[in-house]
C-alpha cells in the first residue's frame, strides 16, 4: 500500500494527476472507479480541504513519465478514510498513463492562505518551517522537545497545509528561541489526528523545559525561494524551488511588485528598485526555467501567491532570468 | 509564436485530407494542440487533442472519422472520409498550461474545408 | 456524457450596460471553464481561463465567475468592440466528450 500521495502537475498543490509513493518510486493511479468519494479522502490526506472534482489524469503537463509505472488498478474508499492507504486497492493488470486519475480539492489556497489559528511554526523561512507554537486560550505556547514524534511533525505539516513532514535533526538557533511564557510538552500524536490539538498532551504550562526545548518542524514546503550571486542573501538572480529542483525566473511582467513580495518573503525589507543594468550584473543562471509571467498584486506574503503560467512553461532564455535587490 | 494552418480545399465526398497545423516559437514536447472547426454561421466544434506527451483524445462523434498525430513542427489532422457535413473552417490551437489543456490562447487563423460533389 | 448548455444565444444590450452569459454544465468541472470571444471572420480569442482567471491583455470588464456546474462571464460597462460572440469551453475531461464548447452567445450592442 502506498506510503505517500500527491498530486502532481496542477495550478497549485491541491490539484492534479494522482501519484502515490510505493517502496521509493512514485507511480500513477489508474481511475478505474476512481470517483469523489476517492477524491474526499485524498484531498483530506493532503489537508487540502474538501473534494470538488475527478478531472482527467492526463489533463495534466507534463504528462507522467514513460517510466514511470501505474501503481494501482483501483482505489474504492468510502469517502470515511483518513488517507487513500485504508482504502480498498486492486493491483495493476491492465492500464496506462491515458487513464491516469486525477483530483481536485475545493481549497487550492491552502498551501498558502492564513494558517491555521490554532498552529503556527515561527521565525523560519516561510510559514512551513519553524518554532512550533500552539494557541491555547488566545496564548500562544511554544512546544517542548520531550515526547515530540515525527508523527506530531506530520499532523502539523497536514494541519498547515505544508505536505509531509521532512525529518530534521535542525535545533531552533539562539535568536529562534520562544519568549513565551508558558509552554508545552508530551506530545503524543498517532499521526492521524486533524490538528495538534487533537493529540494528547501534559497539561498547560506544567513542565520542566526551557527554551532550549522549543520543538522545530520543517515540513516538506511546497514552495522555497533565494537569492544567488550576490553579496548576501537579499540580492542576486531569483531562484525557486520546485520537484527539489531550483530554476531560475523569467523577467517576462516583472516589475516593482513582484520585487517587493520577494523581498518580503525573504524577510529582507523593501525593494531596491533596481535598474535594468543593476539587475544583469547577477548573470545568467542555469538549469531550469521555472516561472514565466509572474503577476503580482503587492499585497502577497510569498511568491507562490502571486500569478504565473505553469511550472515549467517559458518562451525565455536565462538572458531574461530575474535579479531582484531589496534593502536587507 | 504562431501556428498557420494549411491544406484546406474544396474536396468530394469520401476523398481523405490531411490538415496541417505548422508551429514556430515554441516547442510542441511542451504544450497541447487541439483541433476546433467551425461551419459557416455555426458555433465552435471540438475535434481532438493531441497532448505534450502523444497521448490523443477525440470527440465522441469524431473517433474513427478524424486521425491527429504531430512531428516535432507540425500537428496533422486527418479527415479519413470527408461528407458534406464536414465542411467548415479548420483551426489549431495551443494548449495554454497544465490544468488548463483546452484552454487555448493561441490560434491559427483557420483554414477552410469545403467538400461537395 | 458532458454537455455545456449556453444561455441566452443571443443577447442585446446597449454601450455602457452590463451583459451577462450562462454556462451550465451537466455535471461538476471544478472550475476547469473557459471563455473566449469571437468576432466574424476572425479566429476566438481567450478571455478567461480557470472559471475566473483573465487572460493577459484582457480588459478588467470581463469578469468570470462560478464553480460546480454553473458558470457565467459578466461583461460590465459593454463597449461597441465586445459586440461578437462568446463560447465557453470545458477543460475538465476529454472521455465522453461530445463538444467541449457551449453553443455560443451573440452579443450585440446597441
Known amino acids: 500500500s502506498p506510503s505517500g500521495v500527491r498530486l502532481v502537475g496542477g495550478l497549485h498543490r491541491c490539484e492534479g494527476r494522482v501519484e502515490v509513493e510505493q517502496k521509493g518510486q512514485w507511480g500513477t493511479v489508474c481511475d478505474d472507479g476512481w470517483d469523489i468519494k476517492d477524491v474526499a479522502v485524498l484531498c483530506r490526506e493532503l489537508g487540502c480541504g474538501a473534494a470538488s472534482g475527478t478531472p482527467s489524469g492526463i489533463l495534466y503537463e507534463p504528462p507522467a513519465e514513460k517510466e514511470q509505472k501505474v501503481l494501482i488498478q483501483s482505489v474504492s474508499c468510502t469517502g470515511t478514510e483518513d488517507t487513500l492507504a485504508q482504502c480498498e486497492q486492486e493491483e495493476v493488470y491492465d492500464c496506462s498513463h491515458d487513464e491516469d486519475a486525477g483530483a481536485s480539492c475545493e481549497n487550492p489556497e491552502s498551501s498558502f492562505s492564513p494558517v491555521p489559528e490554532g498552529v503556527r511554526l515561527a521565525d523560519g523561512p516561510g510559514h512551513c518551517k519553524g518554532r512550533v507554537e500552539v494557541k491555547h486560550q488566545n496564548q500562544w505556547y511554544t512546544v517542548c522537545q520531550t515526547g515530540w514524534s515525527l508523527r506530531a511533525a506530520k499532523v502539523v505539516c497536514r494541519q498547515l497545509g505544508c505536505g509531509r513532514a521532512v525529518l530534521t535533526q535542525k535545533r531552533c538557533n539562539k535568536h529562534a528561541y520562544g519568549r513565551k511564557p508558558i509552554w508545552l510538552s508530551q506530545m503524543s500524536c498517532s499521526g492521524r489526528e486533524a490538528t495538534l490539538q487533537d493529540c494528547p498532551s501534559g497539561p498547560w504550562g506544567k513542565n520542566t523545559c526551557n527554551h532550549d526545548e522549543d520543538t522545530w518542524v520543517e515540513c516538506e514546503d511546497p514552495f522555497d525561494l533565494r537569492l544567488v550571486g550576490g553579496d548576501n542573501l537579499c540580492s542576486g538572480r531569483l531562484e525557486v524551488l520546485h520537484k527539489g529542483v531550483w530554476g531560475s525566473v523569467c523577467d517576462d511582467n516583472w516589475g516593482e511588485k513582484e520585487d517587493q513580495v520577494v523581498c518580503k518573503q525573504l524577510g529582507c525589507g523593501k525593494s531596491l528598485s533596481p535598474s535594468f543594468r543593476d539587475r544583469k550584473c547577477y548573470g545568467p543562471g542555469v538549469g531550469r526555467i521555472w516561472l514565466d509571467n509572474v503577476r503580482c498584486s503587492g499585497e502577497e506574503q510569498s511568491l507562490e501567491q502571486c500569478q504565473h503560467r505553469f511550472w515549467g512553461f517559458h518562451d525565455c532564455t536565462h538572458q531574461e532570468d530575474v535579479a531582484v535587490i531589496c534593502s536587507g | 509564436q504562431s501556428l498557420e494552418e494549411s491544406g484546406g480545399r474544396l474536396v468530394t465526398p469520401g476523398t481523405p485530407l490531411t490538415l496541417t497545423c505548422t508551429v514556430s516559437g515554441f516547442s510542441l514536447s511542451s504544450y497541447p494542440m487541439s483541433w476546433v472547426r467551425q461551419a459557416p454561421g455555426k458555433g465552435l466544434e471540438w475535434i481532438g487533442i493531441?497532448?505534450?506527451?502523444?497521448s490523443i483524445f477525440y470527440a465522441t462523434w469524431a473517433n474513427g472519422r478524424f486521425t491527429i498525430s504531430k512531428t516535432s513542427t507540425t500537428v496533422d489532422l486527418k479527415i479519413t472520409s470527408p461528407t458534406t457535413e464536414d465542411t467548415a473552417t479548420y483551426f489549431c490551437?495551443?494548449?495554454?498550461?497544465?490544468?488548463?489543456?483546452?484552454?487555448?490562447?493561441?490560434w491559427g487563423q483557420g483554414t477552410l474545408v469545403t467538400v461537395s460533389s | 456524457e458532458l454537455v455545456l448548455t449556453q444561455t441566452p444565444a443571443s443577447v442585446s444590450e446597449p454601450v455602457g450596460g452590463t451583459v451577462t452569459i450562462k454556462c451550465q454544465a451537466s455535471?461538476?468541472?471544478?472550475?476547469?471553464l473557459s471563455w473566449y470571444q469571437q468576432k466574424p471572420g476572425q479566429r476566438p480569442k481567450l478571455l478567461i481561463y480557470?472559471?475566473?482567471t483573465l487572460e493577459s491583455g484582457v480588459p478588467s470588464r470581463f469578469k468570470g465567475s462560478g464553480s460546480g456546474t454553473e458558470y457565467t462571464l459578466t461583461i460590465s460597462g459593454v463597449q461597441c468592440a465586445d459586440a461578437a460572440t462568446y463560447y465557453c469551453?470545458?477543460?475538465?475531461?476529454?472521455?465522453?466528450?461530445?463538444?467541449?464548447f457551449g453553443g455560443g452567445t451573440e452579443v450585440v450592442v446597441k
Open positions: 490551437a495551443r494548449g495554454y498550461s497544465s490544468g488548463t489543456m483546452m484552454s487555448s490562447n493561441l
Open positions: 469551453q470545458q477543460g475538465y475531461t476529454y472521455k465522453n466528450v461530445d463538444n467541449a
Open positions: 493531441i497532448t505534450s506527451g502523444g
Open positions: 480557470r472559471a475566473s
Open positions: 455535471e461538476s468541472i471544478s472550475t476547469y
